[in-house]
């Protein structure tokens, strides 16, 4: 009976995600057969989050909208380890929007999910950010510094990275 009700709950949860994520990839968390964590196929997973590299070229606003219709946000990077994981899936000749912007152009950077902006956990390229008209952040590769962040005009179309919490069933 317990197993039956658990299965019913799982099925109803899966139905919630079906519209935008018809297929999920799930792994067993720990030793308990009851706990599964899932990411939409073909998203990648790291710790408690799922990541998707969007290759369509869009402005920052539309990139965020694109993530939100999939139940995600533009990526919020919280640690060096997280960034190191993300860059494994990026192309060196492309730039990708992050969920970081400075809407007022006053260098008050803010993350899309309201995570406090911590100057100590940022990975700006040297000399960046450097322009008050460039109010959105990208991650890109520079041969001298490897991967880092850069400010850019929000209307310049770029690829982007979406991030969502893992789905637990």
């Amino acid at each position: 009976n317990f197993m039956y009700s658990k299965t019913v709950k799982r099925l109803s949860k899966l139905r919630e995600y079906q519209q935008y994520h018809p297929s999920l990839t799930c792994v067993m968390e720990g030793k308990d057969i009851e706990d599964w964590s899932c990411c939409p196929t073909p998203w990648t997973s790291f710790q408690s989050s799922c990541y998707f590299i969007s290759t369509g070229m869009q402005s920052w606003t539309k990139s965020q909208k694109n993530c939100s219709v999939m139940g995600a946000d533009l990526v919020v990077i919280n640690t060096r380890e997280e960034q190191d994981f993300i860059i494994q899936n990026l192309k060196r000749n492309s730039s990708y929007f992050l969920g970081l912007s400075d809407p007022g152009g006053r260098r008050h950077w803010q993350w899309v999910d309201q995570t406090p902006y911590n100057e100590n956990v940022t990975f700006w390229h040297s000399g960046e950010p450097n322009n008050l008209d460039e109010r959105c952040a990208i991650i890109n590769f520079r041969s001298s510094e490897e991967w880092g962040w850069n400010d850019i005009h929000c209307h310049v179309p770029q690829k982007s990275i979406c991030k969502m919490k893992k789905i637990y069933i």
Epitope: Q58, K62, H153, H155, P157
Partner: antibody, heavy 118, light 107 residues
């Protein structure tokens, strides 16, 4: 007031290149993207690409990739669109347009007719 | 790439008529749509953006509606100066493609 003034008509031979200019005034040149759109005689409109004058970032329509180059000169508030390896199908009026704060084309140049003929 | 299909390609109407032009996108463009008016020998002029927001200085007889993939431009009472060609354009992702145009002619 915002103005985009384009260079004059050009006649080119197939295989040649053309460089059209778009001089902006009446606003902060480096703050707004400039896009290029073309229109063949009696035909519809076709988006070619965009340039951000502040830093020179570009994004091109894949259809023109390798043939189109957009550049800018901040000292004269001018954007340039160069199209190479011209063919007769490139005969068109070429427009520059400013992308406004709302992310749409709010101001357009008057257009430049480029004729490709042998 | 998202394709924009506009219909009709031309129509004849009289002054005072209500005119409707439709634009269908090949994918969801989330209301990121503009409508332009173009007269012979002139550059296009922005009429509406975000599918339904009137651009500055555009008369209120022009209106837009729609969502997802289907959008409509309506001229409630056609005026002599409205005889022109109308284009839709999406701004969801590059390339920002246009519809094929609708020529509004005098009946």
């Amino acid at each position: 007031q915002v103005q985009l003034v384009q260079s004059g008509a050009e006649v080119k031979k197939p295989g040649a290149s053309v460089k059209v200019s778009c001089k902006a005034s009446g606003y902060t040149f480096t703050s707004y993207l400039i896009h290029w759109v073309r229109q063949a005689p009696g035909q519809g409109l076709e988006w070619m690409g965009t340039i951000y004058p502040g830093r020179g970032d570009t994004s091109y329509n894949q259809k023109f990739k390798g043939r189109v180059t957009m550049t800018r000169d901040t000292s004269t508030s001018t954007v340039y669109m160069e199209l190479s390896s011209l063919r007769s199908e490139d005969t068109a009026v070429y427009y520059c347009a400013r992308m406004g704060d709302n992310e749409y084309f709010d101001y357009w140049g008057q257009g430049t007719l480029v004729t490709v003929s042998s | 790439d998202i394709q924009m299909t506009q219909s009709p390609s031309s129509l004849s109407a009289s002054v005072g008529d209500r005119v409707t032009i439709t634009c269908r996108a090949s994918g969801n463009i989330h209301n990121y749509l503009a409508w332009y008016q173009q007269k012979p020998g002139k550059a296009p002029k922005l009429l509406l953006y975000d599918a339904e927001t009137l651009a500055i200085g555009v008369p209120s007889r022009f209106s837009g509606s729609g969502s997802g993939t289907d959008y409509t431009l309506t001229i409630s009472s056609l005026q002599p100066e409205d005889f022109a060609t109308y284009y839709c354009q999406h701004f969801w992702s590059t390339p920002y493609t246009f519809g094929g145009g609708t020529k509004v002619e005098i009946k």
